[in-house]
C-alpha cells in the first residue's frame, strides 16, 4: 500500500525548491526498481516528484489566499514490467498560512449621525475589518480595534469595533468629528499587521439652546395717525440651534396699556410689533412694553434648557401729528 503523511507547504516560501514530504509504496525496497509519477493540476509546474524516491518538492512560491489546497494523484510503476505497483491514489497538499495580509476595512467610507448631548455609552456605529489570512491558523486573522484619533469623545470596543460616545458633545461648539480606528491582527502581538479607517461622525441638533434677544432694549416710533394693525417695527432673537429647534414664538410679557401686540414671522423668525389700539399723542406719547421669546417645539426632556424665557424691553415713542 501507499505510505505518506499529511502534506503541508508554507505559503510565500522563497527557496527554489522546498521539500514537502515523501510518497512511497511499502513494496519499494529502495533498489530504484520503481518509478513514481505525479499527476493533476500543479504537477510538474508547481510540484515535482523525485521519480526514484517519491520525494515531493514545491518549486514555486505559493499564496494560500489564492489557493489553499492542491489535490494531486500519485502513480508508482515497476520499471521492469511497466505495470502499476499500487493503484493510482489521490492525495492533498495543504498550503499553510503565514501572517502576510493586513486587516482591511471593506465598507469604507464610514459615516454616522448621532444626536448632540447623547450620554456616555451611546452606540454610534460598528466598523468591521476583514483579514484574508486563515482564521483557524493561530492569531493571523484575530483582530483588535483601537482608537488612533477621537479621544476623549469616543471609544471603541477592542474585539467588536463598536464605537461609543465617551464624553458628551455640543453641536454648537463642533458639529462633526473625524475618528480614526486601527485594526491590528495577531491580537496586537509582535509581527502584527494593521489597517486603519476614518469615520466621519456628524452631530445632529437637539433643542438645547433657548432663543435670546439680540438686544436687551429696542426703540420704536409710531405715528399717532397709524391705524390699528399697523406694523411699527421688528425685534429679533437668535437661537444657536438649527431647523425646527430654532423656530420661535414672540409674545408680550408686559403692556399695562394693552396697546400693542407681537406676532411672529415664521419665515424670518422675527417678532413684529403691531398696534392693537390707536394712540393719542396728547394722552400718552411714551410707552414701554416687555416682550418675550420662546422656542416653538421643546420636548419635555429638554425643558431644563428653557427654564426662563429671554425678554427685551421696547420703548415706543409716539410721533405727534398736527390736528386740523
Amino acid at each position: 500500500g501507499w505510505v505518506w503523511n499529511q502534506f503541508f507547504v508554507p505559503e510565500e516560501m522563497n527557496t527554489t525548491s522546498h521539500h514537502i514530504g515523501q510518497l512511497r509504496s511499502d513494496l519499494d525496497n529502495g533498489n530504484n526498481s520503481f518509478q513514481y509519477k505525479l499527476l493533476g493540476a500543479g504537477a510538474g509546474s508547481t510540484f515535482i516528484i523525485d521519480e526514484r524516491t517519491g520525494d515531493i518538492y514545491a518549486i514555486q512560491k505559493l499564496d494560500r489566499e489564492e489557493r489553499s489546497l492542491y489535490i494531486l494523484r500519485a502513480q508508482v510503476i515497476d520499471i521492469a514490467t511497466g505495470r502499476a505497483v499500487e493503484p493510482e491514489s489521490e492525495f492533498v497538499i495543504k498550503v499553510s498560512d503565514i501572517n502576510d495580509n493586513e486587516p482591511k476595512f471593506l465598507d469604507e467610507p464610514y459615516e454616522a449621525i448621532v444626536p448632540e448631548m447623547s450620554p456616555e455609552g451611546t452606540l454610534v456605529i460598528q466598523v468591521t475589518a476583514s483579514d484574508a489570512d486563515d482564521p483557524s491558523s493561530g492569531n493571523n486573522a484575530r483582530l483588535l480595534y483601537s482608537l488612533l484619533q477621537g479621544q476623549p469623545y469616543f471609544s471603541v470596543e477592542p474585539t467588536t469595533g463598536v464605537i461609543r460616545i465617551s464624553s458628551k458633545m455640543d453641536r454648537e461648539l463642533q458639529d462633526e468629528y473625524w475618528v480614526i480606528i486601527q485594526a491590528k491582527d495577531m491580537i496586537g502581538q509582535p509581527g502584527a499587521l494593521s489597517g486603519t479607517t476614518s469615520v466621519l461622525i456628524k452631530l445632529s441638533d437637539v433643542n438645547d439652546n433657548k432663543p435670546i434677544f439680540k438686544e436687551s432694549l429696542y426703540r420704536l416710533t409710531v405715528s399717532e395717525s397709524a391705524p390699528t394693525g399697523t406694523s411699527i417695527g421688528t425685534i429679533m432673537a437668535y437661537d444657536n440651534d438649527i431647523g425646527e429647534n430654532a423656530e420661535m414664538d414672540y409674545s408680550i410679557e408686559e403692556d399695562d396699556s394693552q396697546t400693542f401686540d407681537i406676532i411672529t414671522n415664521h419665515e424670518t423668525q422675527e417678532g413684529i410689533v403691531i398696534l392693537k389700539k390707536k394712540v393719542d399723542f396728547e394722552h400718552q406719547n411714551h410707552y414701554g412694553i416687555r416682550a418675550k421669546v420662546k422656542n416653538h417645539h421643546v420636548p419635555e426632556q429638554l425643558m431644563k434648557y428653557h427654564t426662563e424665557a429671554s425678554t427685551t424691553f421696547i420703548k415706543i415713542q409716539v410721533e405727534d401729528v398736527d390736528e386740523p
Epitope: E215, S216, L217, Y218, R219, T221, E254, D256, S257, E282, H283, Q284, N285, H286, Y287, G288, R290, F313, K315
Partner: antibody
Framework: QVQLQESGPGLVKPSQTLSLTCTVS??????????WSWIRQHPGKGLEWIGY???????YYNPSLKSRVTISVDTSKNQFSLKLSSVTAADTAVYYC????????????WGQGTLVTVSS | EIVLTQSPGTLSLSPGERATLSCRAS???????LAWYQQKPGQAPRLLIY???SRATGIPDRFSGSGSGTDFTLTISRLEPEDFTVYYC????????FGPGTKVDIK
C-alpha cells in the same frame, strides 16, 4: 457704569443763548434704545424736563420750551449738547444731563449738574 | 400735561419710623410709568423706584413703591438718618413731569 458730565459757561447774559455740553463716559451714546435728556432745577424748586435726543439725531422737547430749545448729538465725541436761546433770569437753574433706563423712560443716570446764572 | 401733586409738602418723623409719601396725578396714568427719586442737597436726583414698584440697583429694600391710576405711594419702612431729604415723583407716559417734592425732616 455710565457717567455723565455737564460743561459750559456758568454765567450767561439775558437774551443770549445758553450752551451746555454733556460728555458721556463708560458707555456709548450710540447704544440702542437709550435717550439722552436735559433737565433743570430752578434754585430751591422742583425739576423740569427740557428735552431729549436719540443718537440718530431725533429729538423731542418740552412743549413749553420747544420754541427756544435745540438739542444735538455728536456720536464721534460721545457728547450731546443743549442750546437755549433768548434766556432771561427765569432760566437761572442747575442744568442736569441724564440718560433714561433699560426698562423704561425714567432717568437712571444723572450728571452732577452745573449752575447757570442768567445775569447782566 | 399731567400735573403731579405730592403730599405732604413736609413730613416730620423720627429715625426708625415709617414714612408714607403720596403722589397724585391730574389724570389716570399706567402704574408702569411712574418713578420716585431722592435728592440730597447739592446733589443730582437719584433713582429709587420705577414702574412703580421696582427698586433701582443698589437701593435698600426699606424703600418700596405702590399704587395705580392716579394715586401712588412711596414707603420707607424704617427711616435711617441718611433718608432725611427731598423726594420727587415723576411720570413718563405723557411727556415727562415731576411732582414738586416732599421734604422728609427730623422731628
Amino acid at each position: 457704569q455710565v457717567q455723565l458730565q455737564e460743561s459750559g459757561p456758568g454765567l450767561v447774559k439775558p437774551s443770549q443763548t445758553l450752551s451746555l455740553t454733556c460728555t458721556v463716559s463708560g458707555g456709548s451714546i450710540s447704544s440702542s434704545g437709550y435717550y439722552w435728556s436735559w433737565i433743570r432745577q430752578h434754585p430751591g424748586k422742583g425739576l423740569e424736563w427740557i428735552g431729549y435726543i436719540y443718537y440718530t439725531g431725533s429729538a423731542y422737547y418740552n412743549p413749553s420750551l420747544k420754541s427756544r430749545v435745540t438739542i444735538s448729538v455728536d456720536t464721534s465725541k460721545n457728547q450731546f449738547s443743549l442750546k437755549l436761546s433768548s434766556v432771561t433770569a427765569a432760566d437761572t437753574a442747575v442744568y442736569y444731563c441724564a440718560r433714561d433706563g433699560s426698562s423704561g423712560w425714567y432717568f437712571q443716570y444723572w450728571g452732577q449738574g452745573t449752575l447757570v446764572t442768567v445775569s447782566s | 400735561e399731567i400735573v403731579l401733586t405730592q403730599s405732604p409738602g413736609t413730613l416730620s418723623l423720627s429715625p426708625g419710623e415709617r414714612a408714607t409719601l403720596s403722589c397724585r396725578a391730574s389724570r389716570q396714568i399706567s402704574s408702569s410709568y411712574l418713578a420716585w427719586y431722592q435728592q440730597k442737597p447739592g446733589q443730582a436726583p437719584r433713582l429709587l423706584i420705577y414702574g412703580p414698584s421696582s427698586r433701582a440697583t443698589g437701593i435698600p429694600d426699606r424703600f418700596s413703591g405702590s399704587g395705580s391710576g392716579t394715586d401712588f405711594t412711596l414707603t420707607i419702612s424704617r427711616l435711617e438718618p441718611e433718608d432725611f431729604t427731598v423726594y420727587y415723583c415723576q411720570q413718563y407716559g405723557s411727556s415727562f413731569t415731576f411732582g414738586p417734592g416732599t421734604k422728609v425732616d427730623i422731628k
